[in-house]
């Protein structure tokens, strides 16, 4: 029955987010006659592709087709057959593929070519696979959350969509954390954006927005960990690395060749007298935090103020939605509540990191050890990035809202990407008055 045409006139769109650690497929749906209204597009399905990110298929491109099959078949089931041919499919690859392209355009092209051939075999309207820029990733994430929060709507609503939503038209900033990059995007308060590379101008629904955005390549949680390990092993006296970012009792062997595989560790590369080293966890939040801070160069700033590594950052303004790995990690650590202060978060992280690896494995028996082992690092990294990297304070911490979904749609760049490519965000306010959210929620 699922392939019967729906009585109402609806449209669908598919976006694949080819991230550094995994690929996710999102299916969106909207009423055809209300394409230009605000907030009408919503997510009906998310399918996480089993396996790593597409950049890991360099040596096995022939496996990409099988890798994508389950989620593409799921899309075939969810979307009525009568709609297949007119349903656009977009694949956007992010920082994992940016890093692969940095190493070799040929290898990145080869992966994307096979992805395109695989996706072209489905009955949908495939629109192409491409590596999106960090600026696009930041911008589309910002568009997504503000679209879902109703910030582009001219009507001030009498009710709130989500608990943390303020009932005004001030946009939310967007904080996105992936495996290989992190993005910060917001509208600064009447300050000129000193670096042209970080400035975006939008006209959406009749209103102009001057947006600041930056994508920090190599500062996603996975690449940040590789950077930290490469930095710390430089000063290790032997092939044992006593690491405060892992729980006491945790042990893992790392190949030096794996450590130097990524361009992110290039600045720390050196000839080591061993081919492998062993991480031995000592579980100390404060020391872990100090080690992470060494990844942020704050000694040089050619602007009035910077985040780190000489990158311009205007003073923070307004509320921020922190999503993707910001949310997943903090959710696991049970730290997403609006009521938890920054001091409390830090305290809980200290306690979490100090717990023995055996105790952690017992408490979270259902979680894969590879992921479980990295929550101490990831949580500490998030705090370091937000506080020292982006200059949030104990006071402004309350303006960070850890968001997984808004109105059932995942926060992330994919919805904004599709809205843009399908021309569903008009520059001017549509003549017909949009329905209030209450009509269709």
């Amino acid at each position: 029955t699922q392939n019967k045409a729906l009585p109402e006139n609806v449209k669908y769109g598919i976006v694949l987010d080819a991230g550094s650690s995994h690929t996710s497929l999102y299916i969106y749906k909207w009423p055809a006659e209300k394409e230009n209204d605000t907030g009408v597009v919503h997510q009906v399905e998310e399918c996480r592709v089993k396996g790593p990110g597409i950049s890991k298929f360099v040596q096995k491109v022939n496996e990409i087709g099988i890798y994508l099959t389950d989620c593409m078949e799921r899309a075939r089931e969810v979307i009525p057959r009568s709609q297949h041919q007119e349903t656009p499919v977009y694949l956007g690859a992010t920082a994992g593929m940016r890093l692969l392209r940095m190493e070799s355009e040929e290898l990145a092209d080869r992966v994307l070519d096979v992805v395109e051939r695989s996706l072209s075999n489905y009955p949908f309207d495939f629109q192409g696979a491409r590596i999106i820029t960090g600026q696009e990733e930041g911008a589309y994430g910002w568009i997504t959350i503000n679209y879902l929060l109703g910030k582009f709507s001219q009507k001030t609503r009498w009710f709130s969509i989500v608990p943390y939503e303020t009932n005004n038209q001030e946009t939310f900033g967007a904080l996105d954390l992936g495996g290989a990059s992190t993005q910060v995007t917001f509208v600064p308060q009447n300050q000129t954006i000193e670096s042209p590379d970080n400035a975006l101008q939008f006209r959406l629904y009749g209103k102009d927005y001057n947006v600041y955005t930056h994508s920090f390549l190599c500062y996603g949680k996975d690449q940040a960990l590789w950077q930290k390990l490469a930095k710390d092993i430089q000063v290790a006296s032997n092939e044992i690395l006593r690491d405060p970012c892992f729980h006491p009792g945790y042990k893992k062997v790392v190949n030096v060749s794996d450590l130097y595989k990524t361009p992110c560790t290039k600045r720390f590369e050196m000839t080591l007298p061993f081919q492998q080293f062993e991480i031995q966890g000592i579980g100390n939040y404060q020391q872990c935090h100090q080690s992470i801070l060494e990844l942020f160069n704050t000694s040089y700033c050619p602007y009035s103020q910077c985040a780190f590594n000489g990158i311009f950052l205007p003073p923070l303004q307004g509320d921020f939605g922190a999503f993707s790995a910001f949310y997943f990690v903090m959710k696991f650590l049970n730290l997403t509540s609006e009521k938890v202060s920054q001091e409390k978060v830090t305290e809980m992280m200290k306690n979490f990191c100090a717990k023995s690896w055996e105790a952690i494995k017992t408490s979270y028996a259902g979680v894969k050890e590879k992921y479980l082992s990295e929550y101490c690092f990831s949580g500490t990294y998030i705090l370091s990035l937000l506080l020292q990297g982006y200059h949030f304070t104990a006071d402004s911490w309350e303006h960070i809202h850890f968001i997984g979904k808004i109105q059932g749609s995942d926060a992330g760049w994919t919805l904004g990407y599709m809205l843009n490519l399908t021309n569903m965000i008009p520059a001017e306010q549509p003549l017909s008055t949009p329905l209030s959210h209450s009509t269709y929620v």
Partner: antibody
Framework: EVQLQQSGPELVKPGASVKMSCKAS????????MHWVKQSHGRTLEWIGY????????TFNQKFKGRATLTVNTSSRTAYMELRSLTSEDSAAYYC?????????WGQGTLVTVSA | DIVLTQSPASLAVSLGQRATISCRAS??????????MYWFQQKPGQPPNLLIY???NQGSGVPARFRGSGSGTDFSLNIHPMEADDTAMYFC?????????FGGGTKLEIK
């Protein structure tokens, strides 16, 4: 449109150093490596090395290691190469080229003449 | 280091005819199913211009008369039909492994 604009010609004395620049525009500077290539006598092309603008890490052709230094200024989107202890053998055109493994965009070159 | 031997060192071809330049590598330049072989054209006073990447793919804006072929250690660049504007130096390059290396060059002229 991607462009690489290199600094002007240099006349330097033997034993001295030279520092040339390569200003990039039209793309995200930190998304691609910057390579440097030497061309002598209008014929022989030699790869010197590359820098990762993202973090300043570099890799060299052993022949130039220790004598060439590659740096970047990300805010001005500029890559630099300094060559030290110059001899007449270093008289050549030096090019910067953007790429991972594909040198699709090249600067116009900086001509270095080493002469007493 | 991978040595690239280009031949011939110079070549004169009549307009409309075929020019073939070959490049032999001292070891395979293939990896992960890709040939890391490139062909450049260089005219006097100009930087090299990418013609062919990945052994057989045409660079942006490169006319169809430039064709690259080969894999492993043996590669060739074919220009057909030869035009007056094709008078230039031609270089092959490998980027399979550091140090990246270039062939010695082929000077192509009109006969």
């Amino acid at each position: 449109e991607v462009q690489l604009q290199q600094s002007g010609p240099e006349l330097v004395k033997p034993g001295a150093s030279v520092k040339m620049s390569c200003k990039a525009s039209g793309y995200t500077f930190t998304d691609y490596n910057m390579h440097w290539v030497k061309q002598s006598h209008g014929r022989t092309l030699e790869w010197i090395g590359y820098i990762v603008p993202l973090n300043g890490g570099s890799t060299f052709n052993q022949k130039f290691k220790g004598r060439a230094t590659l740096t970047v200024n990300t805010s001005s989107r500029t890559a630099y190469m300094e060559l030290r202890s110059l001899t007449s053998e270093d008289s050549a055109a030096y090019y910067c080229a953007r790429g991972g493994t594909r040198f699709a965009y090249w600067g116009q070159g900086t001509l270095v003449t080493v002469s007493a | 280091d991978i040595v690239l031997t280009q031949s011939p060192a110079s070549l004169a071809v009549s307009l409309g005819q075929r020019a073939t330049i070959s490049c032999r590598a001292s070891e395979s330049v293939d990896n992960f199913g890709v040939s890391f072989m490139y062909w450049f054209q260089q005219k006097p006073g100009q930087p090299p211009n990418l013609l062919i990447y990945g052994a057989s793919n045409q660079g942006s804006g490169v006319p169809a008369r430039f064709r690259g072929s080969g894999s492993g250690t043996d590669f060739s660049l074919n220009i057909h039909p030869m035009e007056a504007d094709d008078t230039a130096m031609y270089f092959c390059q490998q980027t399979k492994e550091v140090p990246y290396t270039f062939g010695g060059g082929t000077k192509l002229e009109i006969k």
